[in-house]
Interface confidence: low
């Protein structure tokens, strides 16, 4: 007989149906059956620990004690559950040199004051913007690449026409305001937006109206990253700006995150019929 459910580990959970639970009460669902917040499911003679955490896609990266980066703390807990081993948050932001991203799966509040969550001004980054954790001030990064998105003209709530839903999401992020699809096809007055450059946009949220100027001036001062930043950007180019403390990443198409470590599944597709969005 196995000594613990981890002896029956499968990629999605723990299946111990091959053992006779009548001779071993280990396989009854009780509070101790599934550690690390696993959900215990008993179906017939099978007891399975499932780690189906409903993690949101907020990008608040943390570094785990296993040296891996996670998109947020929820994904870290999910990984701990799947691995059935303790993973603590050891620092805010991605690990400096991690072995690989924890599948989007992310400061150690430590032994100091566990009841006091560190407040973060990153909370003001909305509409898909990610917070640049290392900025001295509050900077929101719109790392949205619409270059691979199909042409599917739409009229948005700001009265402007966009080539596709991704561009609406991008505009909403850059302006830090809610912009939604109003109707399929171009707006009646045919106002069209201009698309931004291929890389992520850096703008302080309180300077949204000067976004493009800021971006242009920032790009003028980009220089290649020092050697010790090799690997800083997992799927993209590393650039250092004289007015930023840390390098930034220009992500390849289909990748996002501070270090281009996340696959970007947030491209919006318009579903025919009533105007609804589906995140894929």
């Amino acid at each position: 007989f196995p000594t613990s459910l981890s002896d029956c580990q499968t990629p999605t959970g723990w299946n111990c149906s091959g053992y006779d639970d009548r001779e071993n009460d280990l396989f009854l669902c009780d509070t101790n059956t599934c550690k690390f917040d696993g959900e215990c499911l008993r179906i017939g003679d099978t007891v399975t620990c499932v780690c189906q955490f409903k993690c949101n896609n907020d990008y608040v990266p943390v570094c785990g004690s296993n040296g891996e980066s996670y998109q947020n703390e929820c994904y870290l807990r999910q990984a701990a559950c799947k691995q059935q081993s303790e993973i603590l948050v050891v620092s805010e932001g991605s690990c400096a040199t991690d072995a690989g991203s924890g599948s989007g799966d992310g400061v150690h509040e430590g032994s100091g004051e566990t009841s006091q969550k560190e407040t973060s001004t990153c909370d003001i980054c909305q509409f898909g913007a990610e917070c640049d954790e290392d900025a001295e001030d509050v900077w929101c990064v719109c790392n949205i690449d619409c270059s691979q998105t199909n042409f599917n003209p739409l009229c948005a709530s700001d009265g402007k026409s966009y080539d596709n839903a991704c561009q609406i999401k991008e505009a909403s992020c850059q302006k830090q305001e809610k912009i939604e699809v109003m109707s399929l096809g171009r707006c009646q007055d045919n106002t069209t937006t201009t698309t931004k450059s291929e890389d992520g946009h850096y703008a302080r949220t309180d300077y949204a109206e000067n976004a493009n100027k800021l971006e242009e001036s920032a790009r003028e001062h980009h220089i290649p990253c020092p050697e010790h930043y090799n690997g800083f950007c997992m799927h993209g180019k590393c650039e250092h700006s004289i007015n930023m403390q840390e390098p930034s990443c220009r992500c390849d198409a289909g990748y996002t995150g501070q270090h281009c470590e996340k696959k970007d599944y947030s491209v919006l597709y318009v579903v025919p019929g009533p105007v609804r969005f589906q995140y894929v």
Epitope: S91, E92, T119, A135
Partner: antibody
Framework: DVQLQESGPGLVKPSETLSLTCAVS?????????WSWIRQFPGKKLEWMGF???????KYNPSLKNRITISRDTSKNQFSLKLSSVTAADTATYYC?????????????WGQGTLVTVSS | DIQMTQSPSSLSASVGDRVTITCKAS??????VAWYRQKPGKSPKLLIY???NRHTGVPSRFSGSGSGTDFTLTISSLQPEDFADYFC?????????FGGGTKVEIK
């Protein structure tokens, strides 16, 4: 250039409250970074005491948690340390320092330090 | 609390020597380690952060390495101003803790 300067009494009586202030020039303490107090005992051992963040939130060393308060005066661009119920064991050189950046709490700017002796 | 055990506690060396100081953490601190130099009567100065990144203005003779629990500060060619105390610090979890220090003296 960023400069930090500690000030406060060099002698404090046992059971009283030690009060020190760190005046910061060259950078606004509300604009970014974490602003720490560290002390160094006569045997050169260093102890991180706690910090106040640019947004006003605190983090303290649990060994001092019931005695320590770090606050700030944004109008004067300074932050302060109060340590209550001091004993001779609190005799040390006290430094204020600035954290390097968010998510990296190494300290890149330090004050010159002020020696505080606890004695009656 | 995470203990940072620094060794040696003191060493004697000559100008031009290669010097290595080690720091061992009591548990995994990933790469959240800094190194400082403190000259007599002065405050500590940051040399290395994130285990291996040289701070602005720090000479290239200083280098840091390591991850997890074992970390090293190397001075490739000791200069007269390098005779001082050196401390490591972990900041992977609260409370942040320092090593006991290494005194580098003139031989």
């Amino acid at each position: 250039d960023v400069q930090l300067q500690e000030s406060g009494p060099g002698l404090v009586k046992p059971s009283e409250t030690l009060s020190l202030t760190c005046a910061v020039s060259g950078y606004s303490i509300t604009s970014g970074y974490y602003w720490s107090w560290i002390r160094q005992f006569p045997g050169k051992k260093l102890e991180w005491m706690g910090f106040i963040s640019y947004d006003g939130s605190n983090k303290y060393n649990p060994s001092l948690k019931n005695r320590i308060t770090i606050s700030r005066d944004t109008s004067k661009n300074q932050f302060s340390l109060k340590l209550s119920s001091v004993t001779a064991a609190d005799t040390a050189t006290y430094y204020c320092a600035r954290g390097l950046r968010r998510g990296d709490y190494s300290m890149d700017y330090w004050g010159q330090g002020t020696l505080v002796t606890v004695s009656s | 609390d995470i203990q940072m055990t620094q060794s040696p506690s003191s060493l004697s060396a000559s100008v031009g020597d290669r010097v290595t100081i080690t720091c061992k953490a009591s548990q995994n601190v990933v790469t959240a380690v800094a190194w400082y130099r403190q000259k007599p009567g002065k405050s500590p100065k940051l040399l290395i952060y994130s285990a291996s990144n040289r701070h602005t203005g720090v000479p290239s003779r200083f280098s840091g390495s390591g991850s997890g629990t074992d970390f090293t500060l190397t001075i490739s060619s000791l200069q007269p101003e390098d005779f001082a105390d050196y401390f490591c610090q972990q900041y992977s979890s609260y409370p942040f803790t320092f090593g006991g220090g290494t005194k580098v003296e003139i031989k």
